[in-house]
């Protein structure tokens, strides 16, 4: 079935990226994501969800995870870490399905 | 403001890949506000969703098209890119890109016609 | 996946008229992710209303947009010669995103 957008009260977080406005932001559930591009280190980024909650269910890969929760600054201490090297039978990317 | 341009064969083979590039102009990629889709239109008809990505690289693929659909991203370049592979003339269709926030779709690039035939 | 039928197929209005769209879905639809565009002939198609009612920017307010559930309805209140164009309703914000297969708006 697919993942209906929160219809919640807004829940304030921590945001922490190069987007951001202010040290928090306001949104339907709290993110962080990780994220690691070809040839560079690890990025994580905290901040705001509103759409695509399907993202949230996506298994780690080597380049990539998402973590949502839904309760005031719960995204504030998370650090997450990234899957070990796959197969080169699996492709990078999550596909939320 | 952002806009949104599409570019890449305007003929494919049947059999081959459909490969196009949507490159992103008076805006960040890596927003983690918008999503990037992949909208197509067959000739006369309505509109059919391909997929998105975000700037993380996570993506999610209409069923329908998801055992044919790639879609990757390149926030270096500003672009995210469609492959669609063994198509067939029922691939013939328009091809949009557009940027998703919590206000829908907007903007959409201008659209950009790729045939299958040999 | 959600299943969004738009009615009527086609609408004969004149200009100066008043024209009401409906948009159904096979389940419900959150109407915080509910959108409507515009379509013309060799365009790409064109934001009119997000969240279900509230107007992209640089809409006229004869575009209003209502609904909540499983109904949604665009309705444009004096009918203007460039308003002749196909309109699509579309479910986002979860997917797959859907669109309704149009609601072709034709001069009578």
């Known amino acids: 079935d697919p993942v209906k957008p929160s219809r919640g009260p807004l829940v304030t977080c921590t945001c922490e990226s190069p987007h951001c406005k202010g040290p928090t932001c306001r949104g339907a559930w709290c993110t962080v994501v990780l994220v690691r591009e070809e040839g560079r280190h690890p990025q994580e980024h905290r901040g705001c969800g509103n759409l695509h909650r399907e993202l949230c269910r996506g298994r780690p890969t080597e380049f990539v995870n998402h973590y949502c929760c839904d309760s005031h600054l719960c995204n504030h201490n998370v650090s997450l870490v990234l899957e070990a090297t796959q197969p080169p039978s699996e492709q990078p990317g999550t596909d939320g399905q | 403001q952002v806009q949104l341009q599409e570019s890449g064969p305007g003929l494919v083979k049947p059999s081959q890949t459909l490969s196009l590039t949507c490159t992103v102009s008076?805006?960040?990629?890596?927003?983690?506000?918008?999503?990037w889709n992949w909208i197509r239109q067959h000739p006369g008809k309505g509109l059919e969703w391909i997929g998105y990505?975000?700037?993380?690289?996570?993506?999610y693929y209409n069923p329908s098209l998801k055992s044919r659909v790639t879609i990757s991203v390149d926030t270096s370049k500003n672009q995210f890119s469609l492959k669609l592979s063994s198509v067939t003339a029922a691939d013939t269709a328009v091809y949009y890109c557009?940027?998703?926030?919590?206000?829908?779709?907007?903007?959409w690039g201008q659209g950009t016609l790729v045939t299958v035939s040999s | 996946e959600i299943v969004l039928t738009q009615s009527p197929g086609t609408l004969s209005l004149s200009p100066g008229e008043r024209a009401t769209l409906s948009c159904r879905a096979s389940q419900s639809v959150s109407s915080s992710y509910l959108a409507w565009y515009q379509q013309k002939p060799g365009q790409a198609p064109r934001l009119l209303i997000y969240?279900?009612?509230s107007r992209a920017t640089g809409i006229p307010d004869r575009f209003s947009g209502s609904g909540s559930g499983t109904d949604s309805t665009l309705t444009i209140s004096r009918l203007e010669p460039e308003d002749f164009a196909v309109y699509y309703c579309q479910q986002y914000g979860s997917s797959p995103i859907t669109f309704g297969q149009g609601t072709r708006l034709e001069i009578k």
């Open positions: 557009a940027r998703e926030d919590i206000a829908g779709f907007d903007p």
């Open positions: 990505i975000y700037y993380s690289g996570s993506t």
């Open positions: 008076g805006g960040s990629i890596s927003s983690g506000d918008y999503y």
């Open positions: 969240g279900a009612s």
